[in-house]
């Protein structure tokens, strides 16, 4: 589709994706991988590593399949990292997710790509 | 401050003539963002009209104009227009020129506006 | 194309008083929509951005929400000022508007 049409083609467009399949999660109305919880995890100092890391602890769980697959594009670090959480803090996947959508659109409207 | 001036319309045009309208922008990085055309008929909605990427070598028009005008712009001069052709009676709108909200993107949400150039078609 | 429509068309409101405006799209446009105030004679204004964001200057009173193919614009509680034209746009393929709605006073 013409619009938005990224320049700078890659980075954008993956971060484009990303915000489209976190907002069709956030659509759905039924619990989240069973409600899982997620450790919650600093987004601006770790990013999507940690959001990576985090979300790696759910199995069998479809929803987030998609957007796991684009974390692990977007995360281009060598060898795993410790999850950056909050001590001691976890919160149900689905809130992880709306934090994870916020901390992206930021991003992509704010750059620097 | 960041501003948008059009200019071009103003007078009556015959069905079938032509117009180039032109939009004049300032205060900001000109040639690092995308810009648009969007019309709008006496008492009537928003209808957009015409896009055009950052350097000018993406173009997008709506279907009902599609054809008949052409968008284009002079990074140098930070200018971009939009050449009117075979002009029909519903092409009757005020005409606006629109800045896209981030530079990255073609085809966004409009943060600044020109105050519009009107174009009348009639004979 | 993407179809935007807009319900209601009009509405009368008093000052105070919150409102809402719904904006339906024909297919998914995920959250690219935007929302626009005009008053008569002047340019759009830009309100609301990627479904949900305000932009910069726009006071707090108005807000948007929803994704997919169905979106809202609240206003809060309305001013004086806020007596206008309201128009969504989706720019998730090139760019359409919904018809508008005009919120007269009561």
């Known amino acids: 589709a013409p619009g938005p049409v990224p320049r700078s083609v890659s980075l954008p467009l993956t971060l484009k994706e990303l915000i489209e399949e976190l907002s069709n999660i956030t659509q759905d109305q039924t619990p989240l991988c069973n409600g899982s919880m997620v450790w919650s995890v600093d987004l601006a100092a770790g990013g999507f590593c940690v959001a990576l890391d985090s979300l790696t602890n759910i199995s069998n769980c479809n929803a987030i399949y998609r957007t796991q697959r684009i974390l692990h594009g977007l995360c281009n670090r060598k060898a795993p990292t410790t999850v950056s959480s909050l001590p001691d803090t976890k919160i149900e996947v689905a809130h992880f997710i709306t934090k994870l959508l916020s901390y992206t659109k930021q991003l992509f409207r704010h750059g620097p790509f | 401050q960041v501003q948008l001036q059009e200019s071009g319309g103003g007078g009556l045009v015959q069905p079938g003539g032509s117009l180039r309208l032109s939009c004049a922008a300032s205060?900001?990085?000109?040639?690092?963002?995308?810009m648009s055309w969007v019309r709008q008929a006496p008492g009537k909605g928003l209808e957009w009209v015409s896009s055009?990427?950052?350097?000018?070598?993406?173009?997008f028009y709506a279907d009902s104009v599609k054809g008949r005008f052409t968008i284009s712009r002079d990074n140098n001069k930070n200018m971009v227009f939009l050449q009117v052709n075979s002009l029909r009676a519903d092409d009757t709108a005020v005409y606006f020129c629109?800045?896209?909200?981030?530079?990255?993107?073609?085809?966004?949400?409009?943060?600044?506006w020109g105050r519009g150039t009107t174009v009348t078609v009639s004979s | 194309d993407i179809q935007l429509t807009q319900s209601p068309s009009t509405l009368s409101a008093s000052v105070g008083d919150r409102v809402t405006i719904t904006c339906r799209a024909s297919?998914?446009?995920?959250?690219?929509v935007a929302w626009y105030q005009q008053r008569p004679g002047k340019a759009p204004k830009l309100l609301i951005y990627?479904?949900?964001t305000l932009q910069s200057g726009v006071p707090a009173r108005f807000s948007g929400s929803g994704s997919g193919t169905e979106f809202t614009l609240t206003i809060s509680s309305l001013q004086p000022d806020d007596f206008a034209t309201y128009y969504c746009?989706?720019?998730?393929?090139?760019?359409?508007f919904g018809q508008g709605t005009k919120v007269e006073i009561k």
């Open positions: 205060g900001f990085t000109f040639s690092s963002y995308g």
């Open positions: 990627d479904g949900s």
């Open positions: 629109a800045k896209d909200w981030s530079q990255w993107l073609v085809g966004d949400a409009f943060d600044v």
């Open positions: 055009i990427s950052a350097s000018g070598d993406s173009t």
């Open positions: 746009q989706q720019y998730k393929t090139f760019s359409t």
């Open positions: 297919q998914s446009v995920s959250l690219w």
